[in-house]
């Protein structure tokens, strides 16, 4: 009876999300494997988040709007492990917008989700950021490693969206 009611709840939750995400990929987790964590298909999952790589070339503002429409934000990178996971799926000859910007050019970098900007957990390429005119951050492959660079916000780039996993 308990299992039946849990299944019914799950199905109604799935139907609720179905209007936003036509397909979800879910995995069982938790100590009793009773919880399901889901990401929209074909997003990838890492820890408690889902990631989507957009190959549409857009400005930073349009990229953020694009993520927002999908219930996400441009990616906020919190750890080296997270960055390493993300970069596995990136192309080395491309650049991708991050959810990091400095809209006033005061070198006050801010994340789109208001996560505090921690200078100790940043992965700027050597010598970057280097221009107060360049107010948006990308991740790209340079000098044999992935790192961040400041660029003009209106220059179209690919982008990475991030959202919290859906738990049902």
């Amino acid at each position: 009876n308990f299992m039946y009611s849990k299944t019914v709840k799950r199905l109604s939750k799935l139907q609720e999300y179905q209007q936003y995400y036509p397909s979800l990929t879910c995995v069982m987790e938790g100590k009793d494997m009773e919880d399901w964590s889901c990401c929209p298909t074909p997003w990838t999952s890492f820890q408690s988040s889902c990631y989507f790589i957009s190959t549409v070339m857009q400005s930073w503002t349009k990229s953020q709007n694009n993520c927002s429409v999908m219930g996400a934000d441009l990616v906020v990178i919190n750890t080296k492990e997270e960055q390493d996971f993300i970069t596995q799926n990136l192309k080395i000859n491309s650049a991708y917008f991050l959810g990091l910007s400095d809209p006033k050019g005061w070198r006050h970098w801010q994340w789109v989700d208001q996560t505090p900007y921690n200078k100790n957990v940043t992965f700027w390429h050597s010598g970057e950021p280097n221009s107060p005119d360049e107010r948006c951050a990308i991740i790209n492959f340079r000098s044999e490693e992935w790192g961040w660079n400041d660029v003009h916000c209106h220059v179209p780039q690919k982008s990475i969206c991030k959202m919290k996993k859906i738990y049902i």
Partner: antibody, heavy 121, light 111 residues
């Protein structure tokens, strides 16, 4: 007073090359992102190229990508536009302009008087 | 590319009267409360001159008879009381996304 002085325009045959220069004074040139904008006779203004203050990032529209190269020499306060494989449709007055950011966008706040490029056989 | 469409192509206004120029973007050029549209004035034989940035901010040194308004896709430049020195072509431009694009221009003349 800000002054931008373009030079290097002239008559060139299709397929030919030309190098435009823009000498800047009255600004700390090395701190400015710079752009080239052109205006063909009777046509709307068209953005041609942008280069950041350090010269390490350059941007072009598809219409000139691969043919035009923007560069700068901060020690000489000079901006350049190398134009190769010129076509009749590149005929225009070419202006250099200073770029000023505005949040996520920008404005072109100071403009030179322009130099005329004519591509014709 | 974002297409900027200006109207009218030309405008004849009496001295001291109001002139209104419209500009329509093919998609929104707004983000987070700011609109990325600029207005320039170009007099014959001269380079363009910045008048308005961010849709409604008056550039330093520009007379306050010039004003800009609008958001999203629809923008307006208004000259509240036309002066003889305002005879020129006026262009809108979006800087939200490369390639930056300009409107086709509106020629303002005295009636």
């Amino acid at each position: 007073e800000v002054q931008l002085l373009e030079s290097g325009g002239g008559l060139v045959q299709p397929g030919g090359s030309l190098r435009l220069s823009c000498a800047a004074s009255g600004i700390t040139f090395s701190t400015y992102t710079m752009s080239w904008v052109r205006q063909a006779p009777g046509k709307r203004l068209e953005w041609v190229a942008t280069i950041n203050s350090g010269g390490d990032n350059t941007y072009y529209p598809d219409s000139v990508k691969g043919r035009f190269t923007i560069s700068r020499d901060n020690s000489k306060n000079t901006l350049y536009l190398q134009m190769n494989s010129l076509r009749a449709e590149d005929t225009a007055v070419y202006y250099c302009a200073t770029y000023r950011p505005y949040y996520y966008g920008s404005v072109l706040d100071y403009w030179g008087q322009g130099t005329t490029v004519t591509v014709s056989s | 590319d974002i297409v900027m469409t200006q109207s009218p192509d030309s405008l004849a206004v009496s001295l001291g009267e109001r002139a209104t120029i419209n500009c329509k973007a093919s998609q929104s050029v707004d983000y987070d409360g700011n609109s990325y549209v600029n207005w320039y004035q170009q007099k014959p034989g001269q380079p363009p001159k910045l008048l308005i940035y961010g849709a409604s901010n008056l550039e330093s040194g520009v007379p306050d008879r010039f004003s800009g308004s609008g958001s999203g896709t629809d923008f307006t430049l208004t000259i509240s009381s036309l002066q003889a020195e305002d005879v020129a072509v006026y262009y809108c431009q979006q800087s939200d996304e490369d390639p930056w694009t300009f409107g086709g221009g509106t020629k303002v003349e005295i009636k």
